[in-house]
C-alpha cells in the first residue's frame, strides 16, 4: 500500500473546517475490515482520529475530527478538521495499514486575515512643520504574525525610528501595533501596510497631515 | 528518491565541540519529526535525540542531555546536531534518522565521530 | 541495560527458518508499536518490519509476530545474505524517547 498526501502545508482559516488529505490504492477485492488506519499528531505522536477493526474509532482530538467513511473504501483516508484553531496548527501523519504499511505527513497552516489599521497621532492638535509626531498603526485578530510597512506619500519606504510589537490574544490570533516616530513636513501622508505572509494578504491604514484638520 | 546525507564528523579532542549536519531531499521534510541515532564501535544502536517537525518539539536521551543540541531548518531542509563537551563514549557513527508513525523508515549512510586525545 | 532483550546472537544453516525475540521488561511498552530493523555489515540499518507487518519491498520471507509481552522476528528459507545484526525497537510514550534491543548477530552457517 502506497499513502500520499498534499507536499504542500494544507492552508486553513481560523474557525472554518479543514480537509488534510490522505488517500491509497486499495487492492481489488479490498474491505474495510482489513483496514488499520491512524491519524497522530506527528510531533507528539498523540493520536488524532482512528479506524480499525472494520470501524470508526472516533474522535480522541477534541472531538473536532471525522473522516469520509463512505468513500474509506475507494482509498479515501482525508480528515476533516472542524472549527479550526491556532493550536491546531502543525504536522499530521496518516497511517494506513492493510496487508502491508505506508505513511505519510502532512502540514497544516492556519491562518486568519487581520482587521483593516487604525491610525492614531501624537499630538493630534496644533501640529506645524518640523513636530516630532508618533502615529500608530493598529490591526487586530491576525495569524500568523504580521509584516509591516510604512510608506511616505510618493511611496518611498520609511524604515527608521518604526517599533513594532505583536501580541497574542488567549486564542493564539494577533494584535499588531506599529508606532512610526517622524518630523512633520509641510503636509504628507503617511501609510501602514500589515501584510498576512501565509494568506499573502495586505491591510492598509494612512493618516494625512495638513494644515487642515487631519484626514485618516 | 528519499535521502538523507550527513556530514561533519571528524576526529575531536575530549570537551571539544562539533556540529553534524543532515541534508534531506525527496520527501517533504518540514513535515516529518526527525532523530539522531548512534552506534558506538563494535556496539549496537542508541537513540540520541529527536526533534518535531517545526523545530518546537525536542526531545535527548540521559547521556546527552546538556551537552548535545537538535535543530532544523525547514527552509534548507537540513538537520543539525551540535555536540558540546565531547567525551570518549561519544565516539560512534552518527546516523540522521526519518522518522514516519512510530518507526524509523529512511536512515542516513552516517558520519564517524571520533573523540580522542 | 535496555527494556529490550534480545538474544545477542543466532544462528542457521541455509533454507532453515531462524527466529529472533524481542522481549518488554517493562510493563508500559507497547509491544503493538515494535519495528524491527537489519543492519547489514558496514552498512545503514533498513526498516524491516513494523508491527508484525512488512513494508513494502521487504521479501515475505521476513515476517513478524507478537505474543504477550515479546515481539518475534521470523526469517524462513535462510540465505547467506541475511548474516545481519537484527535489531527491535519502540518509541516510549512515558520517556519519550526510543528504545532499541541490544541488538543480535545472525549467522549463517
Known amino acids: 500500500v502506497e499513502v500520499q498526501v498534499s507536499e504542500d502545508p494544507v492552508v486553513a482559516l481560523v474557525d472554518t473546517d479543514a480537509t488534510l488529505r490522505c488517500s491509497f490504492s486499495p487492492e481489488p477485492g479490498f474491505s474495510l475490515a482489513q483496514l488499520n488506519l491512524i491519524w497522530q499528531l506527528t510531533d507528539t505522536k498523540q493520536l488524532v482520529h482512528s479506524f480499525t477493526e472494520g470501524r470508526d474509532q472516533g474522535s480522541a482530538y477534541s472531538n473536532r475530527t471525522a473522516l469520509f467513511p463512505d468513500l474509506l473504501v475507494q482509498g479515501n483516508a482525508s480528515l476533516r478538521l472542524q472549527r479550526v484553531r491556532v493550536t491546531d496548527e502543525g504536522s499530521y501523519t496518516c497511517f494506513v495499514s492493510i496487508q502491508d504499511f505506508d505513511s505519510a505527513a502532512v502540514s497544516l497552516q492556519v491562518a486568519a486575515p487581520y482587521s483593516k489599521p487604525s491610525m492614531t497621532l501624537e499630538p493630534n492638535k496644533d501640529l506645524r512643520p518640523g513636530n516630532m509626531v508618533t502615529i500608530t498603526c493598529s490591526s487586530y485578530q491576525g495569524y500568523p504574525e504580521a509584516e509591516v510597512f510604512w510608506k511616505d506619500g510618493q511611496g518611498v519606504p520609511l524604515t527608521g525610528n518604526v517599533t513594532t510589537s505583536q501580541m497574542a490574544n488567549e486564542r493564539g490570533l494577533f494584535d499588531v501595533h506599529s508606532v512610526l516616530r517622524v518630523v512633520l513636513g509641510a503636509n504628507g501622508t503617511y501609510s501602514c501596510l500589515v501584510r498576512n505572509p501565509v494568506l499573502q494578504q495586505d491591510a492598509h491604514g494612512s493618516v494625512t497631515i495638513t494644515g487642515q484638520p487631519l484626514t485618516f | 528518491e528519499v535521502q538523507l546525507l550527513e556530514s561533519g564528523g571528524g576526529l575531536v579532542q575530549p570537551g571539544g565541540s562539533l556540529r553534524l549536519s543532515c541534508a534531506a531531499s525527496?520527501?517533504?521534510?518540514?513535515?516529518?519529526?526527525m532523530s539522531w541515532v548512534r552506534q558506538a564501535p563494535g556496539k549496537g544502536l542508541e537513540w540520541v535525540a529527536y526533534i518535531g517537525s517545526s523545530g518546537g518539539t525536542t526531545y535527548y536521551a540521559d547521556s546527552v542531555k546538556g551537552r548535545f543540541t537538535i535543530s532544523r531548518d525547514n527552509s534548507k531542509n537540513t538537520l543539525y546536531l551540535q555536540m558540546n563537551s565531547l567525551r570518549a563514549e561519544d565516539t560512534a557513527v552518527y546516523y540522521c534518522v526519518k522518522e514516519s508513525y512510530y518507526y524509523m523508515d529512511v536512515w542516513g549512510q552516517g558520519t564517524t565521530v571520533t573523540v580522542s586525545s | 541495560q535496555s527494556v529490550l532483550t534480545q538474544p545477542p546472537s543466532a544462528s542457521g544453516t541455509p533454507g532453515q527458518r531462524v527466529t529472533i525475540s524481542c522481549s518488554a521488561t517493562?510493563?508500559?511498552?507497547?509491544?503493538?508499536?515494535v519495528s524491527w530493523y537489519q543492519q547489514l555489515p558496514g552498512t545503514a540499518p533498513k526498516l524491516l518490519i513494523f508491527n508484525s507487518q512488512r513494508p513494502s519491498g521487504v521479501p515475505d520471507r521476513f515476517s513478524g509476530s507478537k505474543s504477550g509481552t515479546s515481539a518475534s522476528l521470523a526469517i524462513s528459507g535462510l540465505q547467506s545474505e541475511d548474516e545481519a545484526d537484527y535489531y527491535c525497537?519502540?518509541?516510549?510514550?512515558?520517556?519519550?524517547?526510543?528504545?532499541f534491543g541490544g541488538g543480535t548477530k545472525l549467522t549463517v552457517l
Open positions: 525527496g520527501f517533504t521534510f518540514r513535515s516529518y519529526a
Open positions: 517493562i510493563s508500559n511498552i507497547d509491544i503493538n508499536r
Open positions: 525497537a519502540t518509541w516510549d510514550d512515558s520517556l519519550n524517547s526510543w528504545v
